[in-house]
Every structure is written in structure tokens, then in C-alpha cells.
Interface confidence: low
Amino acid sequence: RKIPKVGHTFFQKPESCPPVPEGSMKLDTGIINENQRVSMSRNIESRSTSPWNYTVTWDPNRYPSEVVQAQCKHLGCINAQGKEDISMNSVPIQQETLVLRRKHQGCSVSFQLEKVLVTVGCTCVTPVVHHVQ
Amino acid sequence: RKIPKVGHTFFQKPESCPPVPEGSMKLDTGIINENQRVSMSRNIESRSTSPWNYTVTWDPNRYPSEVVQAQCKHLGCINAQGKEDISMNSVPIQQETLVLRRKHQGCSVSFQLEKVLVTVGCTCVTPVVHHVQ
């Protein structure tokens, strides 16, 4: 799903307040709901009819440092006999997510949000067949 | 996929630098790669063999303000005849993502990252049936 552009007003104080320095704001350390966790079924990436593999990317100047990307294993879907059925399609499910980018020049450290496109998994769909006359 | 806890060192400056004020850091406004966007197949939520609906939650003090959650429509999966087959399971694919929370007390505005669990879509899997004697 799509993350809309950040509104100019999002980083602003109420109108009656003195303006903030252009370009930066105060970021509290720590993460709200940091202990919240995924409760997905086990090994769905291999048990799915549209199975996928995971690739991990690592960047120490990003939080989270580890970003995991899924890649669909097949063009088609796996049928009850364990064979690929190319009358159906395995398609990626994507999600726009935010990460925090750490930027430092010497002793000056600042942070900025970065939008990252993550493929979370795959699903099996009926193909769109637009017949052209 | 799981976001690990933020390391204490992530918000710190290099050792040779003077310490930063405890509890807050500088957040640059603007979003890196803000124009990047999802390029998913059309209507996969209705074309999937494990179809889902979307629910939108809205919070003006969160960026993005709109967070979309998927809910699987069925317990089973949709077969070639368009009927539900409950020998298979539709299961949610979840992703831990970050949002930016705006907090204000009077004229003091600060921001904090918040972890949000998003169900991105659903996939069709073979059920786990380990029978333990």
C-alpha cells in the first residue's frame, strides 16, 4: 500500500507558537510498541501455493539495519500434486514502509525518514487476460 | 518479518565526540525516496485464491496518517470452481513497519518512531498437521 507524501503541516507547530528552525525537529529516542511482534503462521513462505525465498539486506546506518525482501519462487502456483500450474500466477505483495536513516558528518549526527519498498510475500492469483481484438 | 530492538548505539555519536542530550536527537524533515511507489499487480486482493479486504485507519498525529490493514476473507482458499476449499488455509502475511508519531504539549513538538504491525495481504497454504501421539 502507498504512503502519501508527508504534508508540510505535519512537522509544524500550532500557528500561535514561535516557528521552529527550518529543516529539523526533535526526535525522541526509543520506539513506541517496540515489543510488538508478528504472529504469522510458521514457514508460510515454503507452505504457500505461491512460495517465496527471503533475501536480507543489511545497513548499519539504517534502523532497522536488517530489511528482508521476499522473491516469488515461481511464475505459476503450486497445485495439490506439488507441480507448478502456470494457469495461475504467483505475484509479490508489496508494502511501502519507513526506515530511519542515520547521517553523520564528523560529530554532527542527524536522522531522516526514508521510504523503502518491501516485498513481504507472494499470493496466488488468477491472471488478468485482456483479449485484444 | 520482525524488526529487532533498536540498539543503544544507533542514536549515539562516535566515541570521540561530545555526548548528545539524553533522550532526543535531530530529525531532518522531508522523506528520502518519497516518490518511490508500489508497483503491485492490479486488484490482487480480489483475484487471489486467498482474497482479502482492506480496512483503513486514520490518525492525524501519525505519519503516514493512513495505515491500511488487510483481513483474509475466508478460512480456506478459493478453488478453480470459485468455491471455498477448507483443506487449504488463507493466512495473513504480516509486516512490522515504522510510523512517525507526533507528540505535542503546548508549543513543544517532538516526534517518536512507533512500531506498527500491518497485515499486508493473504496467501494460501497447506495446513500444518503434526499429530503428536
Epitope: 511482534r37 508478528v38 504472529s39 504469522m40 503462521s41 510458521r42 508460510i44 | 478460512l75 480456506g76 477448507i86 483443506s87 488455509n89 493466512v91 497454504v125 495446513p127 500444518v128 498437521v129 503434526h130 499429530h131 503428536v132
Partner: antibody
Framework: QVQLVQSGGGLVQPGRSLRLSCAAS????????MHWVRQAPGKGLEWVSG????????GYADSVKGRFTISRDNAKNSLYLQMNSLRAEDTALYYC??????????????????WGQGTTVTVSS | EIVLTQSPGTLSLSPGERATLSCRAS???????LAWYQQKPGQAPRLLIY???SRATGIPDRFSGSGSGTDFTLTISRLEPEDFAVYYC???????FGGGTKVEIK
């Protein structure tokens, strides 16, 4: 051997709270969904609540929604039922039970193959 | 929600006779999710059958389950004295148990 040992029942006044515990042994507790089932005197079985292996999926019967809270501590191999705002109609023998299969749809039951001995909850003034 | 109705409420039979217990669902239920239990006075329920027809560990073969869709049956081929008890069917969902059938000595 595989067993579930319950504790925490008793006599309580309407509106008060009680916490039931269920200690598991003899199987890999954190692989399985767990359930609470009750039986009012002279009546049939009523499913109360269920919780998945990792607490990610939780379900309640309409009759207890908003008043009862199921939880588990996998490190302690224990299941709990926190019962608040108790009513006379909550009077029953309460059983904890283990889900038969390691399954995805943990709020749905294939069957319950191991049961606790039961603990009596009496709500009366 | 799916409601399970068991019949008869009470079944009066003699040892050695065949018992046929019915469980009817208000809408179609996958046989994967249909189970039967036995409960004797003062005891916890005991799983007999799961997946509509599979016997649980240690259950004698005189107990058998069958059925699909909305109609399921538990059959006890020859009643033994220890089989006189209450029997419940169960399906997945938020109101999973039937009302029970009491099998009593005639």
C-alpha cells in the same frame, strides 16, 4: 507424561475477580494453541477462550468478551485465565485443554486431546 | 455462527447393543474440524474422534465416526459397560460444542 494441572478456582462474590492457572508438562507447550472450556452444573461444555502458540491469535466466547482475558507464558509452560466482573452465570467447572494439532488457524480447533482436571469457580454472594 | 444440534438427547440402550449418535450442523462444516468427546461423571472430557473419522490415541475400534457436510455420526458398534456416558460433538468456531447426548443403561 503429557498433563495439565490447574489451580486458582474458588468461591467469589459477583463483580469480583479470579485468576485461573494451568501448568503444562510432557509436551512442547509453545507449539500448541490452548483453550479454556467450562461446564456449568448439570450442563454441557462451553468453549470460553483460545490462544495461539505465540499469543498472536486470541478468541473469546461472546458471553465472556470484555471480562475475561486469556494469556500464556511459554517460558513457564503456563496458561492463564483472568476473570473480571464475575457473574452468577460464570459458576462452572473450568477446564484448560491443549489443541490437538500444531495449526495455523489457532482460534479454530481441530480437537482438544489433553485436558486439565478442572477447577471449580463459584460466583455467589 | 455454526450451531451443532445433537440427537437424541438421551439414548437408552443395553450393553452389547449398537449406539448411533447424530450431530447436525446449521451449515456445512469441513470434516477436518469435526471432533467427538466422551465425558463420564466427575471426569474431564476425553477426545474420541477427530477429523470426523480418525480415532484418537488409545480409543478402541468399536468407536467410529462418519459423515460430511452438515450430518455427522458417532457409532459405538457394541456398547461396553464403561461406554455409558455423555457424548459431545465439536466443530471449529466461536460456539463449538453440541448440546450432548447421554447414553444410559436401559
Amino acid at each position: 507424561q503429557v498433563q495439565l494441572v490447574q489451580s486458582g478456582g474458588g468461591l467469589v462474590q459477583p463483580g469480583r475477580s479470579l485468576r485461573l492457572s494451568c501448568a503444562a508438562s510432557g509436551f512442547t507447550f509453545d507449539d500448541y494453541a490452548m483453550h479454556w472450556v467450562r461446564q456449568a452444573p448439570g450442563k454441557g461444555l462451553e468453549w470460553v477462550s483460545g490462544i495461539s502458540w505465540n499469543s498472536g491469535t486470541i478468541g473469546y466466547a461472546d458471553s465472556v468478551k470484555g471480562r475475561f482475558t486469556i494469556s500464556r507464558d511459554n517460558a513457564k509452560n503456563s496458561l492463564y485465565l483472568q476473570m473480571n466482573s464475575l457473574r452468577a452465570e460464570d459458576t462452572a467447572l473450568y477446564y484448560c485443554a491443549k489443541e490437538l494439532y500444531i495449526s495455523d488457524w489457532d482460534s479454530y480447533s481441530y480437537g482438544m486431546d489433553v485436558w486439565g482436571q478442572g477447577t471449580t469457580v463459584t460466583v455467589s454472594s | 455462527e455454526i450451531v451443532l444440534t445433537q440427537s437424541p438427547g438421551t439414548l437408552s440402550l443395553s450393553p452389547g447393543e449398537r449406539a448411533t449418535l447424530s450431530c447436525r450442523a446449521s451449515q456445512s462444516v469441513s470434516s477436518s474440524y469435526l471432533a467427538w468427546y466422551q465425558q463420564k461423571p466427575g471426569q474431564a472430557p476425553r477426545l474420541l474422534i477427530y477429523g470426523a473419522s480418525s480415532r484418537a490415541t488409545g480409543i478402541p475400534d468399536r468407536f467410529s465416526g462418519s459423515g460430511s457436510g452438515t450430518d455427522f455420526t458417532l457409532t459405538i458398534s457394541r456398547l461396553e459397560p464403561e461406554d455409558f456416558a455423555v457424548y459431545y460433538c465439536q466443530q471449529y468456531g466461536s460456539s463449538p460444542f453440541g448440546g450432548g447426548t447421554k447414553v444410559e443403561i436401559k
